[in-house]
C-alpha cells in the first residue's frame, strides 16, 4: 500500500482543516488508514482523524481544531496499521479556504433595485470576519450566455444592482463566494443559489 498523491490540506481558519490524498489502488480509507495530527507546541497531544473515501483510491479527512492562529504548524503522519506511509506538515494560515457565505436573499421590492444580501460565515471574533470580500454570480436560467460576476470589495455582505441591468420577465439565479486577501486564500465554495423572477417597469420613452 502506497500513497500516490500526497495529502494536501486547507483550513477554514476556524475549526476544520480538510486533507485529501490518493492511494495507489482502491482503499477502504476508514478501516485501513489513520491520519495523526499534532500542533507543534510544548503541550500539544496527537489527535487521530479517521478518513473517509473520496472516490475509489481517494481519501479525505476532516481535522478538528479548537482554535487557529497564524503561528500554528501541525505535523501530519499517515498510518496504515503499524506502517508509516507519509509524514508531512501543515500551516493552516498558509492554506486557507474560507467557509462559504450563507443565507443569500434577493430583495426585489426596492423600487427597481435588486438588493442581494448574505451572511458572513464567520463569527465577529474570528480574524477573517473583517477581511472577507465577495464575488456574486448572477445568471439566467433561460440564456446560458447571460452570466455575470460582480466583485464586492467592501466589507458589507450586500450588493445593489439596478433591475434594468438584467432582462425583464425571466428567472435568474444568484450565488456568492468569499475570499480574504490578507491570507491570500483560495475562493470559498459557492453558496447555495437562490432564484427570483426579474420584472421591472420599462421607462416611458420621451419624444
Amino acid at each position: 500500500m502506497k500513497v500516490l498523491q500526497e495529502p494536501t490540506c486547507v483550513s477554514d481558519y476556524m475549526s476544520i482543516s480538510t486533507c485529501e490524498w490518493k492511494m495507489n489502488g482502491p482503499t477502504n480509507c476508514s478501516t485501513e488508514l489513520r491520519l495523526l495530527y499534532q500542533l507543534v507546541f510544548l503541550l500539544s497531544e496527537a489527535h487521530t482523524c479517521i478518513p473517509e473515501n473520496n472516490g475509489g483510491a481517494g481519501c479525505v479527512c476532516h481535522l478538528l481544531m479548537d482554535d487557529v492562529v497564524s503561528a500554528d504548524n501541525y505535523t501530519l503522519d499517515l498510518w496504515a496499521g503499524q506502517q508509516l506511509l507519509w509524514k508531512g506538515s501543515f500551516k493552516p494560515s498558509e492554506h486557507v479556504k474560507p467557509r462559504a457565505p450563507g443565507n443569500l436573499t434577493v430583495h426585489t421590492n426596492v423600487s427597481d433595485t435588486l438588493l442581494l444580501t448574505w451572511s458572513n460565515p464567520y463569527p465577529p471574533d474570528n480574524y477573517l470576519y473583517n477581511h472577507l470580500t465577495y464575488a456574486v454570480n448572477i445568471w439566467s436560467e433561460n440564456d446560458p450566455a447571460d452570466f455575470r460576476i460582480y466583485n464586492v470589495t467592501y466589507l458589507e455582505p450586500s450588493l445593489r444592482i439596478a433591475a434594468s441591468t438584467l432582462k425583464s420577465g425571466i428567472s435568474y439565479r444568484a450565488r456568492v463566494r468569499a475570499w480574504a486577501q490578507c491570507y491570500n486564500t483560495t475562493w470559498s465554495e459557492w453558496s447555495p443559489s437562490t432564484k427570483w423572477h426579474n420584472s421591472y417597469r420599462e421607462p416611458f420613452e420621451q419624444h
Epitope: 510544548l42 503541550l43 503561528a71 500554528d72
Partner: antibody, heavy 117, light 107 residues
C-alpha cells in the same frame, strides 16, 4: 460557561503539606492542558506547574520541583496540586488556569495558601 | 530560563490616551506569547495570545504585535476600565515566565 473553582487553601506550618483542588466545568476538560499559577501578596505572577490534557506530561517551575506534584482526574473534571515541604516563600494566592496555546484564557478565583509558624 | 522584562514599570495616563507597553525576552520565543490585565483582588484576564490574537470578548482597542524577543501591547484609546496592571508571559519553553508587570494609573 467555563468555570474553575479552587479549594484546599489555608494556613499551614513550614514543612507541612496541602492539597489544592480545582473543579472545572463548561468545557471538555480532558482536551486541555491545565496550569497552576501563584501570586505572592503584593507581587507579580509566577507560573508553578502544568499538566497535559491526558495527564501524560507534567512540568514544574524550579522553585517547586521535587516538592509539588500536579495531577488530574479527567473522569471528575478536577485538577490537583499536592504541595509538600512547604516554605514561607510559598505563601501566595494559587490560581488554576486553562491553557490556550500556552497562555491562560480562564482562571479560577484563587485560593490563599499561608505558610507560617 | 527565559527572563521577561517590561517597560515602563508604571505609566500615568488619561482617558483617551494611546498607551504602549513593551516586553523583551532574554532569548527568541517565536509567537507563543501573551498579555494579561489584572485589577486588585481579581484574577488576571487574558487579552492577547499567540503574540497578536485578540481573545474573544476583548475590546478591539487592545492589540498585540512583535515576534522573537520584542513584543508590544497597545491600548489605542484608554478607557476608565483599563486602569490596571498588565503582565506579559512567554510559553515558548519551560518554565513559563511572566514579566514583572506594568501599572497603568491616572495622570
Amino acid at each position: 460557561e467555563v468555570q474553575l473553582l479552587e479549594s484546599g487553601g489555608g494556613l499551614v506550618q513550614p514543612g507541612g503539606s496541602l492539597r489544592l483542588s480545582c473543579a472545572a466545568s463548561g468545557f471538555t476538560f480532558s482536551s486541555y492542558a491545565m496550569s497552576w499559577v501563584r501570586q505572592a501578596p503584593g507581587k507579580g505572577l509566577e507560573w508553578v506547574s502544568v499538566i497535559s490534557g491526558s495527564g501524560g506530561s507534567t512540568y514544574y517551575a524550579d522553585s517547586v520541583k521535587g516538592r509539588f506534584t500536579i495531577s488530574r482526574d479527567n473522569s471528575k473534571n478536577t485538577l490537583y496540586l499536592q504541595m509538600n515541604s512547604l516554605r514561607a516563600e510559598d505563601t501566595a494566592v494559587y490560581y488554576c488556569a486553562k491553557d490556550r496555546r500556552g497562555s491562560f484564557d480562564y482562571w479560577g478565583q484563587g485560593t490563599l495558601v499561608t505558610v507560617s509558624s | 530560563d527565559i527572563q521577561m522584562t517590561q517597560s515602563p514599570s508604571s505609566v500615568s495616563a488619561s482617558v483617551g490616551d494611546r498607551v504602549t507597553i513593551t516586553c523583551r525576552a532574554s532569548q527568541g520565543i517565536s509567537s507563543w506569547f501573551a498579555w494579561y490585565q489584572q485589577k486588585p483582588g481579581k484574577a488576571p484576564k487574558l487579552l492577547i495570545y499567540a503574540a497578536s490574537s485578540l481573545l474573544s470578548g476583548v475590546p478591539s482597542r487592545f492589540s498585540g504585535s512583535g515576534s522573537g524577543t520584542d513584543f508590544t501591547l497597545t491600548i489605542s484609546s484608554l478607557q476608565p476600565e483599563d486602569f490596571a496592571t498588565y503582565y506579559c508571559q512567554q510559553a515558548n519553553s519551560f518554565p513559563f515566565t511572566f514579566g514583572p508587570g506594568t501599572k497603568v494609573d491616572f495622570k
